[in-house]
Amino acid sequence: EEELQVIQPDKSVLVAAGETATLRCTATSLIPVGPIQWFRGAGPGRELIYNQKEGHFPRVTTVSDLTKRNNMDFSIRIGNITPADAGTYYCVKFRKGSPDDVEFKSGAGTELSVRAKPSAPVVSGPAARATPQHTVSFTCESHGFSPRDITLKWFKNGNELSDFQTNVDPVGESVSYSIHSTAKVVLTREDVHSQVICEVAHVTLQGDPLRGTANLSETIRVPPTLEVTQQPVRAENQVNVTCQVRKFYPQRLQLTWLENGNVSRTETASTVTENKDGTYNWMSWLLVNVSAHRDDVKLTCQVEHDGQPAVSKSHDLKVSAHPKEQGSNTAAENTGSNERNIY
């Protein structure tokens, strides 16, 4: 009779993570008598996957009934496959011996490859906010995928970005892989409503890529522009001065009025108006009692935005002596030449 051969018909098997792998093995003869064992790897360090004779193998089931006398099918199923299960599996026939069974013949091996989906991409931006015209870096990470081939793209508001660097790790063979990409984005004043998207495509996703997003509202700081104007006289001895704070983001803003360098009033932006581009406007006014001043008054609107160094704008209010008119001995001039902006 022809000598027993161990046949592993599949050179390789590809299984998705979480599914069951079937590793096929048949013997060409019932002789010699003895059990079958399955191993992962070759050499002394090989790992026991299934032993027909003894042991506890909760994830392994046999395809056929190995207790039947004429059985020659030694195929197994391994449940709930993970990338860590990848490797070459050998079906090995042992000859019954005393005290120990003796290895008789091995199959050629079946390489199990595991397809695993990448995790949802996580996009993170810089730790500190940046202002328009600055370049900021965003990172995108996704883990646990196999095989190694993967495509990553960056978008800003639907437009593909080109300035990025991507690494897939590790370089060598591994049970699963990770991808890390860093993209550079130039901020503009209109980016409060913008989004940066990292898109990952992998064979396991069947053409439906995974996306991770970051809102530039978390990253951008748009500094305000200030304008101080003097309104027409409200009453004989009162002047209304307004400070227009325009196009700022985020909302966190504190404004201080100074009269000749002395703090007059401090307030926090509350009832702001939102612009179409997501930035905010706010207005503060100061009622100046002209009769309380003998000399000209320098009014300063000082704004501290989002914890940044204060910016300010000043306005000179001229207080001049006039002949008594309608019971008033001082007047506030409101001519263009009396206004001066100081940064």
Partner: antibody, heavy 117, light 108 residues
Framework: DVQLVESGGGLVRPGESLRLSCAAS????????VTWVRQAPGEGLEWVSL???????YYADSVKGRFTISRDNSKSTLYLQMNGLRAEDTAVYYC???????????WGLGTLVTVSS | EIVLTQSPGTLSVSPGERATFSCRAS??????LAWYQQKPGQAPRLLIY???TRATGIPARFSGSGSGTEFTLTISSLQSEDFAVYYC??????????FGGGTKVEIK
């Protein structure tokens, strides 16, 4: 968590015997090969012996015929019987779990064997 | 028996710097080369196997390269905890599993 704990080291005279044990936990002991590696004081690592899942044994030439590796799967314990000990056997003996890639992924903290007259 | 020769014997590096050391095999081992790290009074720890595959939980700053007889371990930016002795080991399918003599990485 995988744990390997060696015991049985000590001071012996040349020619005497010692039996080292390594208690394993945190993995299915029967499914993996296990090995002994030693390190003489101030020296590098030297592989000593390995026992496969099927009980096949392998030895370094320096210990062949004097050392015997064995395993008790029911106790998840690895042993190294050392006979005819020599001064050059003085070392810290580590046991380690062997992966199917034939590398040693988990190690015990070691047990010191000193052979001196 | 395959003999592994590591060089240099000692490497002095400042924290944050790149460290590269090599392992040469007396005959080809394909890609079957592993790297271990050992700190004083501790057991060795598996870093890399199959020449360039990082073991579970090993940081990305460790990378291995090479095949045949020439291999390199690189630590891209040395951290204080990386100062140790590094050993290479060939893990072809049959014993003896030989180790290199080690490279000590010390603080400059």
């Amino acid at each position: 968590d995988v744990q390997l704990v060696e015991s049985g080291g000590g001071l012996v005279r040349p020619g005497e015997s010692l039996r080292l044990s390594c208690a394993a936990s945190g993995f299915t002991f029967t499914n993996y090969a296990v090995t002994w590696v030693r390190q003489a004081p101030g020296e590098g690592l030297e592989w000593v012996s390995l026992i496969s899942v099927t009980g096949t044994t392998y030895y370094a030439d320096s210990v062949k015929g004097r050392f015997t590796i064995s395993r008790d799967n029911s106790k998840s314990t690895l042993y190294l019987q050392m006979n005819g000990l020599r001064a050059e056997d003085t070392a810290v003996y580590y046991c380690a779990k062997v992966t199917w890639k034939n590398v040693f992924d988990y190690w015990g903290l070691g047990t010191l064997v000193t052979v001196s007259s | 028996e395959i003999v592994l020769t590591q060089s240099p014997g000692t490497l002095s590096v400042s924290p944050g710097e790149r460290a590269t050391f090599s392992c040469r095999a007396s005959q080809t081992v394909g890609s079957k080369l592993a790297w271990y790290q050992q700190k004083p009074g501790q057991a060795p720890r598996l870093l890399i196997y199959d020449a360039n595959t990082r073991a579970t939980g090993i940081p990305a700053r460790f990378s291995g390269s090479g095949s045949g007889t020439e291999f390199t371990l690189t630590i891209s930016s040395l951290q204080s905890e990386d100062f140790a002795v590094y050993y290479c080991q060939q893990h072809t399918d049959w014993p003896p599993y030989t180790f290199g003599g080690g490279t000590k990485v010390e603080i400059k």
